[in-house]
């Protein structure tokens, strides 16, 4: 069993729940309805989990729904740098990966999303209040962040309701040309939901399943929408008490340097790899306004020739900024 | 040792244009996005041009959009400017500049820079 | 665009004396960077995303703020530090500089 704090998912409830309700007529409305909700909330989403079997250990996972190619991905903890946060690990696309201690693991999961485990201490309960904020940034159009932390309660199912917050800074073109298929998809949904009115609701349940493993496939990108969706994913196992953190200095190595290639098995292409991104489904959702920091005084060694800032599409490994040719 | 240098700068009548060259060395310039910053006599910094690492991606202020063309060669590691219809008030030394991801974009490495005059 | 304001325009300040300056912004700034420019020569990075030193900046250089609000601050002045200090946002393009903070040694 996992505690988990997330931005609230496009997915339906688990199979099963339904109860006599039919399985089309329940899951529609319930996907419908998350859109509905979730259509002002920012494009990125934090899940935070806490293994039961290690309660001190914590896995972060971060994704970017929006348009856009994502240069560079930024996890901390403790809330953003002019507040004390601390960087726990800076993923760049070409470029590879840097993570700090208690950074364990930190690796993209798919375009669009990361994830960061962190070392356990060994205590029963560290941090339970502590936030975690992933920043996605497109250099030079703008960047995305949010934040998340595990809720109050350890039970998944008294998350507490997504708080979206206007955090995004770049252009919000590819959100706005969805804003009509959800007004229809709103309207539908209260005509479903006076229909259904007299029988008992559904429980969104959290997913259970791995990060890696593929989810209920309520809401699948478009092929047309996967072009725009680009996001990097990290995960994350760290050890909570900022006593025992081992802070990055600005002339300080990281605990490690990780350089990973373009093709890495972390990093599908193609519709299938959307179709089993996982999506979170609930929980809590922070913002912050100011950019979070990562202690690299050491330019990372290239993987390689043509290795890019912006991802160039000229060339055998890379990808195009999300503006294309101006 | 990463550097910078510009050249191309000069005296121009309003209206008139030229072309600014910055040659990069030292690093992998085609893994780098650059930009073109100028200061001006009243010693403000104002960026007037960035370029993603591949040449493709283009961006740049109201007060240059459709004056000002930025442009590179990564076969060559240079940086180019082309300024036309050019106005007194673009009377500045021009910079080029690199930007480091892993320092957030942080402008890390500048060159010397060029003068630009535009007077009648 | 996002407007930066330096304060103050001009100041001056003895040997190992601590000097702050800071840098407002019209809005949230994603990212704040500082720099040092001296009399006939080009910018200098000295801070990167708000509180980052540069690779070689002596360490009594500190960036701080989040939001609308930076500041750098100097923890004890010397000579050398005398120059112009640019602040710089990157939240989406175009990127600006603040007009400067001339410091000098008194």
């Known amino acids: 069993m996992r505690t988990e704090a997330q931005v609230p998912a496009l997915q339906p409830p688990e199979p099963g729940l339904e109860g006599a309700m039919g399985h089309r007529t329940l899951v529609l409305p319930w996907v419908l309805l998350t859109l509905c909700v979730t259509a002002g909330t920012p494009e990125v989403w934090v899940q935070v989990r806490m293994e039961a079997t290690e309660l001190s250990s914590f896995t972060i996972r971060c994704g970017f729904l929006g348009s856009g190619s994502i240069s560079l991905v930024t996890v901390s903890w403790g809330g953003p740098n002019g507040a004390g946060g601390t960087t726990l690990a800076v993923l760049h696309p070409e470029r590879g990966i840097r993570q700090w201690a208690p950074a364990r693991q930190a690796r993209w999961e798919t375009q669009s999303s990361i994830s960061l485990i962190l070392e356990g201490s060994g205590a029963s309960s560290p941090c339970a209040n502590t936030t975690f904020c992933c920043k996605f940034a497109s250099f030079p159009e703008g960047s995305w962040e949010a934040c998340g932390s595990l809720p109050p309660s350890s039970d998944p199912g008294l998350s507490a309701p997504p708080t979206p917050a206007p955090i995004l800074r770049a252009d919000l073109a590819g959100i706005l040309g969805v804003s009509g298929v959800l007004l229809f998809g709103c309207v539908y949904l209260l005509h479903l939901l006076r229909r259904h009115k007299h029988r008992p609701a559904p429980r969104l349940q959290p997913s259970r399943t791995s990060p890696q493993a593929p989810r209920a496939r309520a809401w699948a990108p478009s092929q047309a929408s996967q072009a725009a969706l680009h996001v990097p994913y990290a995960t994350i196992n760290t050890s909570c008490r900022p006593a025992t953190l081992d802070t990055a200095h600005p002339h300080g190595g990281p605990s490690w340097w990780a350089s990973l290639p373009t093709h890495a098995a972390h990093r599908p292409q193609g519709p299938a790899a959307w179709a089993s991104t996982p999506i979170p489904a609930r929980g809590s959702f922070v913002s912050v306004e100011n950019g979070l920091y990562a202690q690299a005084g050491e330019r990372p060694p290239h993987t390689g020739p043509g290795l890019t800032l912006f991802p160039d599409p000229r060339g055998p490994r890379a990808m195009e900024g999300p503006l294309g040719v101006r | 040792e990463v550097q910078l240098v510009e050249s191309g700068g000069g005296l121009v009548k309003p209206g008139g244009s030229l072309k600014l060259s910055c040659a990069a060395s030292?690093?992998?310039?085609?893994?780098?996005?650059m930009s073109w910053v100028r200061q001006t006599p009243a010693k403000r910094l104002e960026s007037v041009a960035t370029?993603?690492?591949?040449?493709?991606?283009?961006y740049y202020p109201d007060t240059v959009k459709g004056r000002f063309t930025v442009s590179r060669d990564n076969a060559k590691n240079t940086l180019y400017l082309q300024m036309s219809s050019l106005r007194s008030e673009d009377t500045a030394m021009y910079y080029c500049?690199?930007?480091?991801?892993?320092?957030?974009?942080?402008?890390?490495?500048w060159g010397q820079g060029t003068s630009v005059t535009v007077s009648s | 665009q996002i407007v930066l304001t330096q304060s103050p325009a001009i100041m001056s300040a003895s040997p190992g004396e601590k000097v702050t300056m800071t840098c407002s912004a019209s809005?949230?700034?994603?990212?704040m960077y500082w720099y040092q420019q001296k009399p006939g020569s080009s910018p200098r990075l000295l801070i990167y995303?708000?509180?980052n030193l540069a690779s070689g900046v002596p360490v009594r250089f500190s960036g701080s703020g989040s939001g609308t609000s930076y500041s750098l601050t100097i923890s004890r002045m010397e000579a050398e530090d005398a120059a112009t200090y640019y602040c710089?946002?990157?939240?989406?393009?175009?990127?600006?500089f603040g007009a400067g903070t001339k410091l000098e040694l008194k």
């Open positions: 500049a690199r930007h480091d991801d892993f320092l957030y974009y942080a402008m890390d490495y």
């Open positions: 370029i993603n690492n591949g040449g493709i991606n283009t």
């Open positions: 710089q946002q990157w939240t989406s393009y175009p990127l600006t």
């Open positions: 030292g690093f992998t310039f085609s893994s780098f996005a």
């Open positions: 995303d708000t509180s």
């Open positions: 809005s949230s700034v994603s990212y």
